[in-house]
Interface confidence: medium
């Protein structure tokens, strides 16, 4: 009997830079197959109780399942199957070659890399506030996760965190930022967002709804290990910077694909962050093979073989560039309106 609950059943989550989120693929009959969300008599836009896939998340060493439902459609042809019977059973499946298949996606909670903060703070001398302290990141453009202005709430009091030049000078090791990203279940700290980026990136609608909070905090102890000891209340200021962070768990991640090659494991690199695909321009920050290893991995190809920057003689050649070594670190792609040097990458083909 083949079921995703079986301890030796092989599954993986692909088309994402996180091993704990993506479209579900299963290994049956000597190959990996993408599972269509129309399986088990479901409609292609039906959401399931994610707990039904808890064994899959466990086997992937991820946390609890968060969502189970239709995932972004993919352009590359691959083996796609529709299965019948009980949800999670793979003993009766058929290939859905020409049909439009909305892949089944699963998101499990990323495992925490550090010890989570205590759920209940130790008792303090003052009786108020009673609710445990908590953090939130105010969403950014296109509803980014794990990127934005930090807000701290203690009981009913909430507000932004004033972050001045002296804080920057004292906090070179970024212990506090790492602790905050980790507390938000957003991985580790990547960079500070300039206030303009943090504010202007919010949706106008969201900005209107999100009224300024009545109080403000400042950093009390940048080496704190529990939230209630990190900040102290101050009188709100109209000027000055507020703490805005980008953590490694940010979404959406940049997706990549290879086009125009003789196989799916070679071609010009294209990327997208949102709806449109565009050529990735060669960048001086990507001279190591790390970027291309990651691209090859995302295509489910073997290891990176070679890359060639194509001539950028055409002043009208456009594309997108990423200033970081790896695309997974790229919070924003920069549009290049001219002289974009495209890149041709060859990965090892796992099925030559």
């Amino acid at each position: 009997r083949l079921s995703w609950d079986d301890p030796d059943f092989q599954t993986r989550l692909t088309r994402s830079n996180s091993r704990c989120q993506g479209q579900l693929e299963v290994y049956i009959k000597y190959g990996w197959h993408m599972v269509c969300s129309q399986s088990w008599g479901r409609s292609s836009n039906q959401w399931e109780d994610p707990n039904q896939a808890s064994k899959v998340c466990q086997r992937l060493n991820c946390g609890v399942p968060l969502s189970l439902g239709p995932f972004l459609i993919t352009d590359r042809h691959q083996s796609q199957i529709t299965c019948y019977g009980r949800l999670g059973s793979f003993s009766n499946c058929s290939h859905s070659g020409r049909d439009v298949c909305r892949p089944l996606g699963l998101t499990c909670l990323e495992p925490q890399t550090t010890t989570p903060p205590p759920t209940r703070p130790p008792p303090t001398t003052t009786p108020e506030p009673t609710a445990p302290p908590r953090l939130q990141l105010v969403a950014q453009a296109a509803g980014r996760h794990c990127a934005g202005v930090v807000e701290f709430y203690s009981g009913s009091l909430g507000g932004t965190i004033s972050y001045e030049a002296q804080d920057k000078a004292q906090d070179k090791t970024q212990v506090l930022e790492n602790f905050l990203c980790s507390s938000l279940q957003c991985g580790s700290f990547l960079k500070h967002l300039p206030e303009t980026e943090a504010a202007t990136a919010q949706d106008p609608g969201e900005l209107r709804e999100h009224q300024p909070l009545p109080i403000q905090w400042t950093i009390r102890n940048s080496s704190c290990t529990s939230l209630e000891h990190c900040f102290r209340k101050i009188k709100p200021r109209n000027s000055g910077q507020v703490l805005a962070l980008l953590c490694s768990g940010f979404q959406p991640k940049v997706q990549s694909r290879l086009v125009g090659g003789s196989s799916i494991c070679e071609g010009t690199v294209e990327v997208r962050q949102g709806a449109q695909w565009a050529a990735l321009c060669d960048s001086s920050s990507a001279k190591s093979s790390l970027r291309w290893e990651e691209v090859c991995q995302e295509q489910q190809c073997g290891s990176f073989n070679s890359y060639q920057a194509l001539d950028a003689g055409d002043p009208t050649s456009r594309g997108l560039s990423c200033p970081h070594q790896k695309l997974s670190q790229c919070h924003e792609l920069t549009e290049r309106k001219s002289y974009c040097k495209k890149v041709f990458v060859t990965c090892q083909d796992p099925n030559p």
Partner: nanobody, 122 residues
Framework: EVQVVESGGGLVQAGGSLRLSCAAS????????MYWYRQAPGKAREMVAA???????YYEDSVMGRFTIFRENAKNTVYLQMNSLKPEDTAVYYC????????????????WGQGTQVTVSA
């Protein structure tokens, strides 16, 4: 919120052509794929054609070679060019967009238009 609006339907003689348009507006930053479905009286709704954000297209067998789906990404618009129309193509044509919600995280919601009537007379 997302709105999907179809236009371009009408009455046409067999062998004639029509072009349907479908525009998605609102929070459409993450359109994954757009589809045309149709529903004839007393029949189930069926998919006619689909196009993904990368340009891959799919067609139902009975329209292959006669219908062409294409999209204008900048306008979040998808078109269905229908040539050599037959009386059996008579139906209400619906546009459907797969859009990853406001967070672009990959998960989809389907959005439907109200439909546009296409009538092909013999």
């Amino acid at each position: 919120e997302v709105q999907v609006v179809e236009s371009g339907g009408g009455l046409v003689q067999a062998g004639g052509s029509l072009r349907l348009s479908c525009a998605a507006s609102g929070d459409t930053i993450c359109i994954s794929a757009m589809y045309w479905y149709r529903q004839a009286p007393g029949k189930a709704r069926e998919m006619v054609a689909a196009i993904t954000s990368g340009g891959s297209t799919y067609y139902e067998d009975s329209v292959m070679g006669r219908f062409t789906i294409f999209r204008e990404n900048a306008k979040n618009t998808v078109y269905l060019q229908m040539n050599s129309l037959k009386p059996e193509d008579t139906a209400v044509y619906y546009c459907n967009a797969d859009i990853a919600g406001h967070n672009c995280s990959g998960y989809l919601k389907e959005y439907w238009g109200q439909g546009t009537q296409v009538t092909v007379s013999a």
